[in-house]
């Protein structure tokens, strides 16, 4: 990499103008950040604080329960995915402060921005696994009684993580550092070597596998679960179901802007005004997606407070109550009292 010293703020954010004024000192430039970048920085800061502390707490609470409680395994894995992504935030924050200058090298450029996509795939695959679990609890309680165990849950999580890593590879491979001549700046971004078809393919795969397909399948899944739950008028707690639905809903809400801008940019010419506008919003969309990394602990706390009536317990015990719930399945009227009682000891709540 060619050397230059970026410590001076004078280059800042210099806009290329065709208006010619030979008296203007061209190296002395405005150092103010754009509004979307400022908003992104605020979001990043909040997400980092809440995400690191919140997810660390969730990991601490669920790690002790993961041996015996399957729900704890699910929430532990979600928290690990979120916690990992939060670790990249100080670097991303620093880059935006420096007008997207990337002084951290090529390896960091490939790995750190890819963490949010790893989080996206890991989260949605884990949520799909959790949703399948909820579905089976409602519709196949006997199967759950016989086969649903911690070992199988860990295998499912391992498969989800493996697939997530596999799906993140394209982003990882195409990330490069580009050193621009003026203003002197190293940028970290994706480079498809002007191959628009490849760029579109990656964007479409990301949209379909990371958003549209999960949105469709999980909507159908939860429609069935909620209809069955309401039709049975289950008197027992639907705490976990409510929490999972909230987590799933937040996933799609916070990833929507990123996915929409991503697919649009892949179909636009890099020099077009719309592309440039979307590019200016890119950091904001990434930061909005990053809210996913801190929202889950907030959902758990809000859910815990709701279920407790008011916050009487300490935060760890409140989280433990929400995340490690042992539940009862009451899905078939033909079950005998003893069957229900046995299952109450063995399976998780809907």
């Amino acid at each position: 990499m060619d050397s230059f010293n970026y410590t001076t703020p004078d280059y800042g954010h210099y806009d290329d103008k065709d208006t010619l004024d030979l008296n203007t000192p061209v190296d002395k430039t405005s150092n103010t950040l754009r509004v979307p970048d400022i908003l992104a920085l605020v979001i990043f800061a909040v997400v980092f604080l809440v995400g690191v502390l919140g997810n660390a707490l969730v990991v601490w609470v669920t790690a002790f329960e993961a041996k015996r409680t399957i729900n704890a395994i699910w929430f532990l894995n979600l928290a690990v995915a979120d916690f990992l992504s939060c670790l990249a935030l100080p670097i991303l924050f620093t880059s935006i402060v420096q007008h997207h200058h990337w002084p951290f090298g090529g390896a960091a450029c490939s790995i750190l921005p890819s963490l949010i996509l790893l989080n996206m795939y890991a989260s949605i695959l884990l949520l799909a696994t959790i949703s399948a679990d909820r579905f089976l609890l409602v519709f196949k309680p006997i199967w759950c009684q016989n086969f649903r165990g911690a070992g199988l849950a860990w295998i499912a999580c391992a498969v989800a993580w493996g697939l997530a890593l596999l799906l993140t590879i394209p982003s990882f491979l195409y990330r490069v550092v580009r050193e621009e001549y003026f203003p002197p700046k190293v940028l970290c971004g994706v480079d498809y070597s002007h191959d628009k078809r490849r760029e579109r393919a990656v964007a479409i795969v990301r949209l379909v596998l990371g958003f549209l397909w999960p949105l469709l399948t999980l909507t159908i899944c939860y429609t069935f679960i909620l209809l069955r739950t309401w039709s049975r008028r289950a008197t027992r707690s639907t705490k976990t179901l409510k929490v999972v639905v909230a987590v799933v809903a937040s996933f799609f809400i916070f990833w929507l802007p990123y996915q929409v801008t991503g697919i649009m940019m892949s179909f636009l010419e890099p020099s077009s005004p719309t592309f440039l506008l979307l590019k200016k919003l890119d950091s904001l969309c990434v930061s909005f997606a990053y809210i996913n990394c801190c929202i889950n602990p907030i959902i758990y706390v809000v859910a815990g407070q709701g279920f407790q009536g008011r916050l009487r317990k300490s935060l760890p015990s409140l989280l433990r109550n929400v995340l490690t719930e042992e539940s009862v399945v009451r899905e078939s009227k033909s079950f005998t009292r003893s069957t229900v009682d046995t299952m109450a000891q063995k399976t998780q709540a809907v």
Epitope: T8, T24, P25, V26, D27, Y181, F182
Partner: antibody, heavy 119, light 112 residues
Amino acid sequence: QVQLKQSGPGLVAPSQSLSITCTVSGFSLTSYGVDWIRQSPGKGLEWLGVIWGVGGTNYNSALKSRLSISKDNSRSQVFLKLNSLQTDDTAMYYCASPYYSHYVPFAYWGQGTLVTVSA
Amino acid sequence: DVVMTQTPLSLPVSLGDQASISCRSSQSLVHSNGNTYLHWYLQKPGQSPKLLIYKVSNRFSGLPDRFSGSGSGTDFTLKISRVEAEDLGVYFCSQSTLVPPTFGGGTKLEIK
């Protein structure tokens, strides 16, 4: 009117250093940077480096360890120093300045300094 | 580094004919600000290169309108609609989007 005038030795012995001065007029060195470029039959036109108006430098990675660019704003002079010369450093050396901004570099060129590296 | 490939190496033309020189870059030259920093220079024998066209299609001061530049991304073209004697020399394309700025190998425009 922008002008760049170069001065420096024509013949340099191998392993010695090359020093070229570029004196500019028509613009201020505090506002505009100056680039150095060389041209040889073997390598064509090759960018060496730049010194920005604010004083920062940027060098071609292939020459970074041997190259140094500095300036004297008050005398409107830019200096190129290339150490440990080899025969393949034989080339015509140019200083160049931008048009309006560094987004349009190498708009104005010096007359060139022919440097021959030979014992 | 970005490799700039110019074709043809030599272009024999008759005065008054149209000439077309192609330049291809190994990477996209679109800057993060949306502009493309691809420039064209002419070097006459014994002289320093002179800027003709900057940012793909903008003519530098005093350049006749028979010169035009076009292209995007990685493929660019310089056209001279009616070649005159004073146009002869070696034409270079150059990019200043990325570090280091790089130049094409040159195209020699000569009389047929």
